[in-house]
């Protein structure tokens, strides 16, 4: 099949006093390989401070993922989410607010 | 090639203000943050903070806000330092520096020598 | 703002000789998830500085493997089994685990 761009979608949730949980998940992509990270200062965090979501299919022929990681809170400008895939890349901010889903589709 | 290639040197006046810029080659700008470092003479190294040329979203050291302003022109893969209100104590080597997948400072650029005199 | 302290400020070796540089952080650089950004730089008179070892003990590409970095926590340390000409100049221990990133005094390691 033809090349489907991801959505991204970045959000938070609380944690332990003091740091927030971010989630990035990527949906509706197409082939299955790609890249999905967290970085710090632009900086892939290390494997072992990530948690990872398996690619899996989303019954519509095309593909979804996520990984997650702790952060403090207050610091949420230093990380992003940083997506590869079909030989398009995009960054993508934590959201400032607890309540907002981030939603971006990347061509 | 991964190149950095920083501008000449410079001599300011005290008072003045002065743009350092950095161009890169090699690879895909919007990639990787640019990051900024100071070096006076003799001294040790300074973070002046860095820019992320995909969103334009920067973070500096709050000892230069408001003095360093870094920005990006994608379309000529270049990032610039702005330092304003010069005194001799910006006088230094100013380097631009570029990440790698889990490391900060992997390719550096030459350094631009930047002179405050009057 | 974090602050670095290096030890030696001066190491005069032998070539051929172990050299053992300590760096201590004013607070621990561990960050909220487990990552470690504690990186050493070497920097040779005239020339830009060079990544050596970053998160902690992993060696940059094309650094060779008689250096080493360890530690944990507030205490680091960058060994270099056997010293070779090449090796002389100014090590910098550096964080980047909380804002302000900052850099130490460096030390200065030369020939007896």
């Known amino acids: 099949g033809s090349t489907v761009p991801p959505m991204v979608n970045v959000t938070r949730s609380e944690a332990s006093e003091g740091n927030i949980t971010v989630t990035c998940r990527a949906s509706s992509f197409y082939p299955r390989n790609i890249i999905l990270t967290w970085r710090q200062d632009g900086v892939s965090l290390s494997h072992d401070t990530q948690q990872w979501g398996d690619v899996l299919p989303d019954g519509n022929g095309t593909y979804q993922t996520w990984v997650a990681t702790r952060i403090c809170r207050g610091e949420e400008q230093r990380f992003t989410c940083y997506m590869e895939h079909s030989g398009n890349h995009s960054t993508h901010p934590v959201p400032s607010g607890n309540s907002h889903h981030h939603h971006h589709h990347h061509h | 090639e991964i190149q950095l290639q920083q501008s000449g040197p410079e001599l300011v006046k005290p008072g003045a203000s002065v743009k350092v810029s950095c161009t890169a080659s090699g690879y895909a700008f919007t990639k990787y943050n640019i990051y900024w470092v100071k070096q006076s003479h003799g001294k040790s190294l300074e973070w002046i903070g860095y820019i992320d040329p995909y969103t334009g979203g920067t973070i500096s050291n709050q000892k230069f806000t408001g003095r360093a302003t870094l920005t990006v022109d994608k379309s000529s893969s270049t990032a610039y330092l702005h330092l304003n209100s010069l005194t001799s104590e910006d006088s230094a080597v100013y380097y631009c520096a570029r990440p790698g997948s889990y490391w900060y400072f992997g390719v550096w650029g030459a350094g631009t020598t930047v002179t405050v005199s009057s | 703002d974090i602050l670095m302290t290096q030890t030696p400020l001066s190491l005069p070796v032998s070539l051929g000789d172990q050299a053992s540089i300590s760096c201590r952080s004013s607070q621990s650089i561990v960050y909220t998830n487990g990552n470690t950004n504690l990186e050493w730089y070497l920097q040779k008179p005239g020339q830009s500085p060079k990544l050596l070892i970053y998160?902690?003990?992993n060696r940059f590409s094309g650094v060779p493997d008689r250096f080493s970095g360890s530690g944990s926590g507030t205490d680091f340390t960058l060994k270099i089994s056997r010293v070779e000409a090449e090796d002389l100049g100014v090590y910098y221990c550096?964080?980047?685990?909380?804002?302000?990133?900052?850099f130490g005094s460096g030390t200065k390691v030369e020939i007896k």
């Open positions: 998160k902690v003990s």
């Open positions: 550096f964080q980047a685990s909380y804002v302000p990133f900052t």
